[in-house]
Amino acid sequence: AKLGAVYTEGGFVEGVNKKLGLLGDSVDIFKGIPFAAPTKALENPQPHPGWQGTLKAKNFKKRCLQATITQDSTYGDEDCLYLNIWVPQGRKQVSRDLPVMIWIYGGAFLMGSGHGANFLNNYLYDGEEIATRGNVIVVTFNYRVGPLGFLSTGDANLPGNYGLRDQHMAIAWVKRNIAAFGGDPNNITLFGESAGGASVSLQTLSPYNKGLIRRAISQSGVALSPWVIQKNPLFWAKKVAEKVGCPVGDAARMAQCLKVTDPRALTLAYKVPLAGLEYPMLHYVGFVPVIDGDFIPADPINLYANAADIDYIAGTNNMDGHIFASIDMPAINKGNKKVTEEDFYKLVSEFTITKGLRGAKTTFDVYTESWAQDPSQENKKKTVVDFETDVLFLVPTEIALAQHRANAKSAKTYAYLFSHPSRMPVYPKWVGADHADDIQYVFGKPFATPTGYRPQDRTVSKAMIAYWTNFAKTGDPNMGDSAVPTHWEPYTTENSGYLEITKKMGSSSMKRSLRTNFLRYWTLTYLALPTVTDQEATPVPPTGDSEATPVPPTGDSETAPVPPTGDSGAPPVPPTGDSGAPPVPPTGDSGAPPVPPTGDSGAPPVPPTGDSGAPPVPPTGDSGAPPVPPTGDSGAPPVPPTGDAGPPPVPPTGDSGAPPVPPTGDSGAPPVTPTGDSETAPVPPTGDSGAPPVPPTGDSEAAPVPPTDDSKEAQMPAVIRF
């Protein structure tokens, strides 16, 4: 059976029907359906006016405008809001009421596309294998990234989150139109990896999506990941404005100027250094989501009531931090180079600025405990990877799972750890599953391009597709049309159960309490440490171009610090605010050919895509299970002003009193302020745009970051918090 032309809200579309073997099964593929009008720079997406005749949806459209991997030119287009659909078909009737899976790509909110990299004439995010093996409809789409997707002044002049609103437009389009393709509009599952996983999480928390999403899967990224929310957007907006010659003294004038600046110039005005970094990569990425008081009405930690009815899977790769650790500390992948205590202490101190010397020392001590018994370089390098994995991915994911569970009504919660080792031959043998290694298995690459893979890789891929698509069908990864290798138990706050995904799976694959000691450390011990004040945490911003390596902090910490013996000398302070996700060198969707895998085939595996970040804001709590953070103040208090030289600190996300940014839709009315302190009343929705949602009740409205004082830009506020 095949669909032929399908009528959508924009008009008729016609795809391609691809036959699958001799049994008569096929897949209808639609590429390049517009889900919104061509974008205007730094404006919310608008509905597409439609077309006459039948749109031939046979080729992927260009990605959204972004810098190339070399960051010296751009590719993609401003007219980029298109989606792609794969519909599996049997021999006789056309499919009806199929579950729908919508993929959100990663790439640091800086790069990427709905189709991904092309290798062996097969795109990374080609939905065919998932669709046909799992009997689900797969949808992928483009959204704006980088400055065009996320530049914000932190107020109503440029509220930001344009890329998130693009994502929402795609989700809403699917809800309204997917029935015509044979999908069930009441059974939509979002899934995504890295910045895409965090986006999935944010979409479930946004009041704009109320009633649109049934289930969600976050792979290596959640809304609570420390690289997801930009707390000092004005700093980054000004960096770009200066570069393109816009005035920075007045936010309204700056915003108007930025809107009429050549989008390519805006894109190229922001560069991320990829080598010779003085600080961890996460400190250099500034264009990510913000708390705008509207689409993201409050700190994500306080929005979990909005996801109370959404089934949720979240997980990480066992060495998600490897790619970032190897950029921050290149010795990790070099057998002839050593990681020293000094190196690691310096890295730790850069992640723990807000807790000063004690934060650096206690964290260093916790992570190096095993070094006494095993001082081998392999153990030390694994420690560095574990540290970045914990901070950037694992701990925030555990907190997100605990929050989801604590707020869930009927919804189920599942956790996983993906441990099938990386196939990059240039990596040391001890490297496990690196960031983005999971994507190729979810998208069935071992089946689509078999020459690059081994039978064990197909086993992993088959299992992941089965769990993922069963979950999309029923909300339970064990139940559906696909057999699974072992039973995956739900996550509860009591058992902290998670499924370890490997090439050999059985009853022992169901495990409990992943890295509990480290989780407890970050959410209890570290959180309780006092936040440093005044000059103890005075960051020095990058000088000149935003891509320039920042000047290191002045004072004793210019040289690599040694582990402290007393309480002298504050650790070095990184240059930026608390957000950002570095790009991964060859990203999953760059054109650069990936390194071929080991084994007997020359076909490469999918290279890492994705992003990174900074430490999470942990909850308080006192039990052994991952503590559920309070719904009020979401973490450490904000860093106090650093002397008289910097902009004011980010207000606390608790009861700060600062008014929310007025909504950016048609309505000028501000969001309704909450009454009472209930944690579970979900935020009422609004539609695709316009009328503002009511922020959640509770004692934390997470007022959007106020614009920083234009006259004092000498230093950047240190707002990295756990």
Epitope: G4, A5, V6, Y7, T8, E9, G10, G11, F12, E14, P47, H48, P49, G50, W51, Q52, G53, T54, M169, A172, W173, K175, R176, N177, A179, A180, Y208, G211, L212, P685, T686, G687, D688
Partner: antibody, heavy 119, light 105 residues
């Protein structure tokens, strides 16, 4: 100017079929989708389906799937709507309506055709 | 299917009055169209894409809203405006509201 002229009123017995025509003029026939909307006596408007006169592609509302067929004749710039297995509740005025621009705003309407289903 | 709920279902007003008719969509929609229908006549397009006036429609008619809540406003009622008004959503299966009958008080 755009004109849509529909065929005359019909009286049909339950179980029979009816075929209503809609002749278009004043614009390029194959460039705009044509929709069919019906209105039962004293009731609201109900969308039945749409045809692209350019390639004949159709889409029908779930409620009418299997009972309705929309066709076109480009040589006479006419679209047709046939409804089978008629029941008394199909008694209504049937309108053809052309897209205004883009998609979905129904900018130009025929005068309507009353179909009465009665035994 | 997307549900469209119009309110009120009927309304009495006088010439010169300002009148507002609302239409609520569930779930949210992208665009809304408004039509006017007089007894024994075919409907006539008034407003398309939420707020754009169809050609030949007087400027006293205006539309606004987004997401789930939309309004049609007639700023100063004229005798010829007494009719039934329908909203319509645009999706793969367009649906109309049940109509609002505007009568002379």
């Amino acid at each position: 100017q755009v004109q849509l002229v529909q065929s005359g009123a019909e009286v049909k017995k339950p179980g029979a079929s009816v075929k209503v025509s809609c002749k278009a003029s004043g614009y390029t026939f194959t460039s705009y989708n044509m929709h069919w909307v019906r209105q039962a006596p004293g009731q609201g408007l109900e969308w039945m389906g749409v045809i692209n006169p350019g390639d004949g592609a159709t889409s029908y509302a779930q409620k009418f799937q299997g009972r309705v067929t929309m066709t076109r004749d480009t040589s006479t710039s006419t679209v047709y709507m046939e409804l089978s297995s008629l029941r008394s509740e199909d008694t209504a005025v049937y309108y053809c309506a052309r897209d205004y621009y883009g998609s979905s705003p129904l900018g130009y309407w025929g005068q309507g055709t009353l179909v009465t289903v009665s035994s | 299917d997307i549900q469209m709920t119009q309110s009120p279902s009927s309304l009495s007003a006088s010439v010169g009055d300002r009148v507002t008719i609302t239409c609520r969509a569930s779930p949210s929609i992208s665009y809304l169209n408004w039509y006017q229908q007089k007894p024994g006549k075919a409907p006539k397009l008034l407003i398309y894409a939420t707020s754009s006036l169809a050609s030949g429609v007087p400027s006293r008619f205006s539309g606004s809203g987004s997401g789930t809540d939309f309004t049609l406003t007639i700023s100063s009622l004229q005798p010829e405006d007494f009719a039934t008004y329908y909203c319509q959503q645009r999706s793969s299966s367009p649906t109309f509201g049940q109509g609002t009958k505007l009568e002379i008080k």
